[in-house]
């Protein structure tokens, strides 16, 4: 399972898309800026083994695969490009599946923190709360955006647990 | 470290061309905005405008726009302010400084150094 | 373009003392304000963020508050290192506007 280095290039190319599919200069839209409150300290204080680290970029993958599959996402952006992050991260979802029958067996669950996935689980619910709030505004998207692509980023703790060994 | 290095004190005369910079490093350099501070000799902090070096977007300030123009080249992780043509009342203090952009992070939270641009015949 | 006003222009105060500047802006900027600290010679320096929110390494000794128009910068114990002018910062909107200072000097 060479999960690192596959994972790390999709990811890549899902941050390139995400970057790509803004429509509207990002400086109209400070007024709309949120504390969306990404559990980084949690994550970062935490030593993930792989079966977790897995499981917990899954739900963040599966989670914005979700909130960029709605009607609101397609109204929101350009159709092909769309399209093309959601494949990206299909693809990711599958790769980490694939993954973890992999590293545990196709018997075993994998061990789930669930205080991380409910923290990543509460993350996306605000942000799709916000959403809601500013009616799936042409900026709130915008901020939504930044904010996937800096919890992207923020991930580094978890993909250093997908080097380690368990 | 997250750093700002920008480019060394410049002494011009009026009418001729200047191009400062502003050196990101510590950080990725596109996930953040740069943002051109002025400050004249003995005076407050006046807010240029302001670069998305991830595709180049800028946005000036009234007062500024049509007088300087900002730039970044992402691969060498900078940032530019330059004049076509400068007056004596350019001479002051430029600072570079770090923008979280639509994220919930401190505004300016890492300056430049400063530099000094005087302009004299 | 939003317009930023402080009061006191300066103040001179003793080591121990509190300190408060204020800063109003021509139109409610929710909580988008921020205030840096410069001393002479050197690049501001970013202090309180979103009006209230201490940034990473400042002393606590600073606190920010306030909320629409009106927005207040305490020293709750001035030290000697504090000897600076500070600027308030709305960011709500371009162009960022800051205002004209204030100067705390020792008495």
């Known amino acids: 399972c060479d999960l690192p280095q596959t994972h790390s290039l999709r990811n890549r190319r899902a941050l390139i898309l995400l970057a790509q599919m803004g429509r509207i200069s990002p400086f109209s839209c400070l007024k709309d800026r949120h504390e969306f409150r990404f559990p980084e300290e949690e994550f970062d204080g935490h030593q993930f083994q792989k079966t977790q680290a897995i499981s917990v970029l899954h739900e963040m993958i599966q989670q914005t695969f979700n909130l960029f599959s709605t009607e609101d996402s397609s109204a929101a952006w350009e159709q092909s490009l769309l399209e093309k992050f959601s494949t990206e991260l299909y693809q990711q979802l599958n790769d980490l599946e694939a993954c973890v029958i992999q590293e545990v067996g196709v018997e075993e669950t994998p061990l789930m923190n669930e205080d991380f996935i409910l923290a990543v689980r509460k993350y996306f619910q605000r942000i799709t709360l916000y959403l809601m709030e500013k009616k799936y505004s042409p900026c709130a998207w915008e901020v939504v955006r930044a904010e996937i692509m800096r919890s992207f980023s923020f991930s580094t703790n978890l993909k250093k647990g997908l080097r380690r060994k368990d | 470290e997250v750093q700002l290095v920008q480019s060394g004190a410049e002494v011009k005369k009026p009418g001729e061309s200047l191009k400062i910079s502003c050196k990101g490093s510590g950080y990725s350099f596109t996930s953040y905005w740069i943002g051109w501070v002025r400050q004249m000799p003995g005076k407050g902090l006046e807010w240029m405008g302001i670069i998305d070096p991830s595709d180049s977007d800028t946005a000036y300030s009234p007062s500024f726009q049509g007088q300087v123009t900002i730039s970044a080249d992402k691969s060498i992780s900078t940032a530019y302010l330059q004049w076509s043509s400068l007056k004596a009342s350019d001479t002051a203090m430029y600072y570079c400084?770090?923008?979280?952009?639509?994220?919930?992070?401190?505004?300016?939270?890492?300056w430049g150094q400063g530099t000094l641009v005087t302009v004299s015949s | 373009d939003i317009q930023m006003t402080q009061s006191p222009s300066s103040l001179s105060a003793s080591v121990g003392d509190r300190v408060t500047i204020t800063c109003r802006a021509s139109q409610s900027i929710n909580r988008f304000l921020n205030w840096y600290q410069q001393k002479p010679g050197k690049a501001p320096k970013l202090l309180i963020y979103?009006?209230?929110s201490l940034q990473s390494g400042v002393p606590s000794r600073f606190s920010g508050s306030g909320s629409g128009t009106d927005f207040t910068l305490t020293i709750s114990s001035l030290q000697p290192e504090d000897f600076a002018t500070y600027y308030c910062?709305?960011?709500?909107?371009?162009?960022?506007?800051f205002g004209q200072g204030t100067k705390v000097e020792i008495k």
């Open positions: 910062q709305q960011a709500i909107d371009l162009p960022f506007t």
């Open positions: 400084a770090r923008h979280p952009g639509l994220n919930w992070a401190p505004d300016f939270d890492y």
């Open positions: 979103a009006a209230s």
